[in-house]
C-alpha cells in the first residue's frame, strides 16, 4: 500500500515547510485516495477487458452511483459552499457500501483496497470538521446498505467485475469533481 | 500516449462565430476537465473555459456570454464556438486537458484571424 | 478573479547561470500553483505542479516553491534549451489565471 499523506519522502526533503493548512491535508488526503484507485483501475483492467466494454451503461444504470449535478452547488455556475459540502460528505459516506464490496475483488491489490477504504473514512472526518451544517448530512441506512451489498455479491462474475470497474470509475470522477470544489472553499 | 488534435476555420470575419474541435486520442475521455485557452499575438495566455465529460462547464465570466463549450463523448471530442467576434478575438487557439493540477497535455494550437 | 503576477516580464542570462522568476497572487491560493515552459510557435509545456512537485520528464535543475501568494521557480544552472517564456498559473478558483508571461533570453 502506499505511504499515507503526511509521510511521503517529499515531506521529509522539505523539514522546514510551513504545516500543511486544513485545506491542503483536505487535498493531500484526496491525492492519497486517488492514487490508491489509480492501482486497482490498473489491476482491473488488466484482468478483465471491462474498461472497453460497451455493456457499461447497462451495468451502470442499476448501479445508484453519487454523482455531482448543477444543484448540488459544487461547480462554477452557482456554487455554495455549504451545499457542496454536504453533497461531498453524503457522497463519500453513499460510497462506503461500494468500497466495502471491493474488499474482496482484489489479489495483488488486497492492501491497496483497504487504504483506500480507511483513507476515505479520515477525510470524512476532515470534511466533517470543516461543515458548519451536519445536520444536513443523511447518513445511508445499514440495513439498506447490508442488502444492497447482499445483492452485489450475488451478482454473477460478469456483473461483479463490471460492478468493480464502474465503482473505481465513479470514485475517482466524484474525487476529482470534489477536490476542484474544495480548493475554492 | 494522449494527444489532442484540433481543427477549425482559421480566418472570419467580424461578428461571425467561431468553431472549433478538439479530438482526444489513445486514453480516457472521462474523469478530465477538456479546457479552452487562447493567446493573441505576442501576448500571455487566457484561459475560455472547460467541460467535464458529463457536460458540465465553468466558462471565464469575461468570455461567458459569448462562449459555448460542447462534448461528444461518442466521438472523444469537445468544440469550442464563440459568437460575434471582433479582432480582438484573433489569437492562438489551444485546446488542453486539465488534470487535477494544472494543463498536462496540450493540442497544437490553431490561429485564428478576424478580420474584414 | 485572481490576478497573477509575474517578475521580471524579462531577463537576460548565460548558460550555466541560475535563474529566479517570481509569481505573485492578488489572493492566497494556498499550493494550487502550476509552472508552465513555452517555445516560439509551441503549445505551453507544464513543468510543475502543486507550486513545488516536478511533473514527470522535466529535469532536476528546475525546481518550485512558495505557498499562499509568493512563489519561485528556479533554474539552477541554465541549459540553451531552456530559452523560452515561463508562466505561472493559479488553480484555486474559477477563472484560472496566468501570470503575463517572462521571457529569458540569451545574454
Known amino acids: 500500500a502506499p505511504v499515507p499523506p503526511g509521510e511521503d519522502s517529499k515531506d521529509v526533503a522539505a523539514p522546514h515547510r510551513q504545516p500543511l493548512t486544513s485545506s491542503e491535508r483536505i487535498d493531500k488526503q484526496i491525492r492519497y485516495i486517488l492514487d490508491g484507485i489509480s492501482a486497482l483501475r490498473k489491476e482491473t483492467c488488466n484482468k478483465s477487458n471491462m474498461c472497453e466494454s460497451s455493456k457499461e451503461a447497462l451495468a451502470e444504470n442499476n448501479l445508484n452511483l453519487p454523482k455531482m449535478a448543477e444543484k448540488d452547488g459544487c461547480f462554477q455556475s452557482g456554487f455554495n459552499e455549504e451545499t457542496c459540502l454536504v453533497k461531498i460528505i453524503t457522497g463519500l459516506l453513499e460510497f462506503e457500501v461500494y468500497l466495502e464490496y471491493l474488499q474482496n475483488r482484489f489479489e495483488s491489490s488486497e492492501e491497496q483496497a483497504r487504504a483506500v477504504q480507511m483513507s476515505t473514512k479520515v477525510l470524512i472526518q476532515f470534511l466533517q470538521k470543516k461543515a458548519k451544517n451536519l445536520d444536513a448530512i443523511t447518513t445511508p441506512d445499514p440495513t439498506t446498505n447490508a442488502s444492497l451489498l447482499t445483492k452485489l455479491q450475488a451478482q454473477n462474475q460478469w456483473l461483479q467485475d463490471m460492478t468493480t470497474h464502474l465503482i473505481l470509475r465513479s470514485f475517482k470522477e466524484f474525487l476529482q469533481s470534489s477536490l476542484r470544489a474544495l480548493r475554492q472553499m | 500516449q494522449v494527444q489532442l488534435q484540433q481543427w477549425g476555420a482559421g480566418l472570419l470575419k467580424p461578428s461571425e462565430t467561431l468553431s472549433l474541435t478538439c479530438a482526444v486520442y489513445g486514453g480516457s475521455f472521462r474523469g478530465y476537465y477538456w479546457s479552452w485557452i487562447r493567446q493573441p499575438p505576442g501576448k500571455g495566455l487566457e484561459w475560455i473555459g472547460e467541460i467535464f465529460h458529463s457536460g458540465s462547464t465553468n466558462y471565464n465570466p469575461s468570455l461567458k456570454s459569448r462562449v459555448t463549450i460542447s462534448v461528444d463523448t461518442s466521438k472523444n471530442q469537445f468544440s469550442l464556438k464563440l459568437r460575434s467576434v471582433t479582432a480582438a478575438d484573433t489569437a492562438v487557439y489551444y485546446c488542453a486537458r486539465e488534470d487535477i493540477d494544472d494543463f498536462d497535455i496540450w493540442g497544437q494550437g490553431t490561429m485564428v484571424t478576424v478580420s474584414s | 478573479d485572481i490576478q497573477m503576477t509575474q517578475s521580471p516580464s524579462s531577463l537576460s542570462a548565460s548558460v550555466g547561470d541560475r535563474v529566479t522568476i517570481t509569481c505573485r497572487a492578488s489572493?492566497?491560493?494556498?499550493?494550487?500553483l502550476a509552472w508552465y515552459q513555452q517555445k516560439p510557435e509551441k503549445a505551453p509545456k507544464s513543468l510543475i505542479y502543486?507550486?513545488?512537485s516536478l511533473q514527470s520528464g522535466v529535469p532536476s535543475r528546475f525546481s518550485g516553491s512558495g505557498s499562499g501568494t509568493d512563489f519561485t521557480l528556479t533554474i539552477s544552472s541554465l541549459q540553451p534549451e531552456d530559452f523560452a517564456t515561463y508562466y505561472c498559473q493559479q488553480y484555486k478558483s474559477y477563472p484560472r489565471t496566468f501570470g503575463q508571461g517572462t521571457k529569458v533570453e540569451i545574454k
Open positions: 502543486a507550486a513545488s
Open positions: 489572493q492566497g491560493i494556498s499550493s494550487w
